[in-house]
């Protein structure tokens, strides 16, 4: 999906008002310095691409974050403010059925959510030059 035509300011508002709090809740008990940010993004569409990938694609050591509250809200925000996004997700979500895993919070998941927090912070500051 091409995130170029999303309403970035509306997505930012949703992040600031609610998604950010859910990410913090997920990470509660974890020191903010515990994980190094290794995933970056260069502009808002790129950030949303990375956010979608980290949030919804299973990775080694972290089967699925998609059941978490922040993920549900991310999915809804993208569906509302990215034209055509929800249509692309209907087929994609059906395919995920085959690889569903039980919900377990692992250190790898915590690291992944820490990366997500960094991507969202970058998304919210699009005019900053990449380090």
């Amino acid at each position: 999906y091409d995130f170029t035509n999303c309403d970035f300011e509306k997505i930012k508002a949703a992040y600031l008002s609610t998604i950010s709090k859910d990410l913090i809740t997920y990470m509660s008990g974890t020191k903010s310095t515990e994980f190094n940010n290794t995933v970056s993004c260069s502009n808002r569409p790129h950030c949303l691409t990375e956010i979608q990938s980290l949030t919804f694609n299973p990775t080694a050591g972290c089967a699925s974050l998609a059941k978490e509250m922040f993920a549900m809200k991310t999915k809804a925000a993208l569906a509302i403010w990215c034209p055509g996004y929800s249509e692309t997700q209907i087929n994609a979500t059906q395919a995920m059925k085959k690889r569903r895993k039980r919900k377990v919070t692992t250190n790898k998941c915590l690291e992944q959510v820490s990366q997500l927090q960094g991507l969202w912070r970058r998304f919210n500051r699009p005019l900053l030059k990449q380090q």
Partner: nanobody, 115 residues
Amino acid sequence: EVQLVESGGGLVQPGGSLRLSCAASGFTFSSYWMGWFRQAPGKERELVSAIFSDGSTMYADSVKGRFTISADNSKNTAYLQMNSLKPEDTAVYYCTRDSTDTRYWGQGTLVTVSS
């Protein structure tokens, strides 16, 4: 088996109100997020509102301030209160239950806004 049954659609004049209901069965209502999509003739389906188990909500710009989504977990029912309706709100409205692996749809209810 998951079932979603919408009701409350109909013909209404511009400026009027309608309340759509979505009766859900076959799952724990509060464990998922519920949404209302709509599809106008010749247009893509669009998500106009969503409600989450923590009570938070999201609205598309086109309906914000006019539509209100709510849920009654004890009745396993979601609602969409639609006020100040406009002709451009004419569409089939679908209730959805969204989870990790699939999106369940109701059969839809037609809302026609016309004088």
